[in-house]
């Protein structure tokens, strides 16, 4: 097909951020057009020669992908009618941080828009009381981070008080020698109050609670993308 | 500020070889894709080489492959380009030019080729 | 190959619109990018992805795309923008259209 008149599409990605062997998604968005066959997606990766990913007549075309993508990607085809030109990412890697293109051709003209992927690797804390030790402490472990996450303690009593004096923090590295484990161990713990043992680096930031009283011990957690926006 | 220095050119017989060098700076070297564009007197733009930020990737035009070679060194900030077996029509203006996407975003001065016997 | 087609040169009196086209094969589906070049100097981007103009680039730099042409018009021409003209594409490598000596009269 051909583009016969010059029209710009709205095209809309989301900065986004992948956990290292794992899935990931980079976000695009694009006004849609009513014939699939009409439509190409290219994703572009700044850096790279090759393509990230191409579809094009309603399948991957991928006779220009690059190396390093190699059965690692796949749009959501039946979604692509609709405006979703959203790429899978398959075992994240390191080095698949940087700034991409997503490019998008229809009936109605092109468009583009660019989207940072930052990678590392993020995990939930479970914060436990160590019965093991010869005072009342607790024990925050995530199992996977990376880059070197900063550990802060904090507690819902003693509201701004500075727990590094009380705690002790240690990161060691995993099997595959890039992602580490944190452990942190709070000393020194008082009864009838909440801890929160908050770990943090430029990709995510995440929260292990821990509620302890006489008669039970309640525990939350959660984990937050940093710096995700449009 | 962005600059790219080309330097290496100069006379040389057909048969020889020459590598010419491209010192990069202002930017993240190893995020960007790099290329080699020449310009024989009087003549128009011919892409040359194109190598990955990471060097890995490298397109070569037709009329220069099994000849030349593309690399960098990334902990130095230079790309390279070696030339093998030049041959008159090889005579020109090299530059190296920063890829963009599917452009090319700066460019440096140039590094004259001469290939005479 | 994909190839592109510039005429070899185009006039135009200072103050007037100068218009440069760029033929190719649906042109209109691929990204197009305009280099001036003056003489003994390096290219210069002066129009990136169709329209898109550099920061430093004067607003009187504008390009489009669309069928089987892009192009590249200068508005208001001034004597300083003689110079030749290249049109550009990615096909699996750098493709520079054949180029148009912009003459100032």
């Known amino acids: 097909f051909g583009i016969s008149g010059r029209h710009s599409i709205t095209v809309t990605t989301v900065a986004s951020a992948g956990n290292i062997g794992e899935d990931g998604i980079l976000s695009c968005t694009f006004e849609p057009d009513i014939k699939l066959s009409d439509i190409v997606i290219q994703w572009l990766k700044e850096g790279v020669l090759g393509l990230v990913h191409e579809f094009k007549e309603g399948k991957d075309e991928l006779s220009e992908q690059d190396e390093m993508f190699r059965g690692r990607t796949a749009v959501f085809a039946d979604q692509v009618i609709v405006g979703n030109a959203s790429l899978r990412l398959k075992n994240v890697q390191l080095t698949d941080a940087g700034t991409y293109k997503c490019y998008i051709i229809t009936s109605k003209g092109k468009g583009n828009a660019n989207l940072e992927y930052k990678t590392g690797a993020f995990s939930m804390p479970e914060v436990n009381v160590d019965y093991n030790a010869s005072s009342e402490t607790l024990r925050c472990e995530a199992p996977r981070w990376f880059p070197q996450p900063t550990v802060v303690w904090a507690s819902q009593v003693d509201q701004g008080a500075n727990f590094s004096e009380v705690s002790n923090t240690s990161f060691e590295l995993n099997s595959e020698n890039v992602t580490m484990k944190v452990v942190s161990v709070l000393y020194n713990v008082t009864i009838n109050n909440t801890y929160s043992c908050m770990i943090e680096n430029d990709i995510a930031k995440a929260t292990g609670d821990i509620k302890v009283t006489e008669s039970e011990i309640k525990r939350r957690s959660h984990l937050q993308l940093l710096n995700s926006k449009a | 500020e962005v600059q790219l220095v080309e330097s290496g050119g100069g006379v040389v017989q057909p048969g020889r070889s020459l590598r010419l060098s491209c010192a990069a700076s202002?930017?993240?070297?190893?995020?960007?894709?790099m290329n080699w564009v020449r310009q024989a007197p009087g003549k128009g733009l011919e892409w040359v080489s194109a190598?990955?930020?990471?060097?890995?990737?490298?397109y070569y035009a037709d009329s220069v492959k099994g000849r030349f070679t593309i690399s960098r060194d990334n902990s130095k900030n230079t790309l390279y380009l070696q030339m093998n077996s030049l041959r008159a029509e090889d005579t020109a203006v090299y530059y190296c030019?920063?890829?963009?996407?599917?452009?090319?975003?700066?460019w440096g001065q140039g590094t004259t080729v001469t290939v005479s016997s | 190959s994909y190839e592109l087609t510039q005429p070899p040169s185009v006039s135009v009196a200072p103050g007037k619109t100068a218009r440069i086209t760029c033929g190719g094969n649906?042109?209109?589906?691929?990204?197009v990018h305009w280099y001036q070049q003056k003489p003994g100097q390096a290219p210069v981007l002066v129009v990136y992805?169709?329209?898109d103009r550099p920061s430093g680039i004067p607003e009187r730099f504008s390009g489009s795309n669309s069928g089987n042409t892009a192009t590249l018009t200068i508005s208001r021409v001034e004597a300083g923008d003689e110079a030749d003209y290249y049109c550009?594409?990615?096909?699996?490598?750098?493709?520079f259209g054949t180029g148009t000596k912009l003459t100032v009269l």
């Open positions: 649906n042109i209109g589906s691929k990204s």
């Open positions: 030019a920063r890829k963009r996407w599917y452009g090319m975003d700066v």
């Open positions: 992805d169709d329209s």
């Open positions: 202002g930017f993240t070297f190893t995020s960007r894709a």
């Open positions: 550009q594409v990615w096909d699996r490598g750098m493709i």
């Open positions: 190598i990955s930020g990471s060097g890995a990737t490298a």
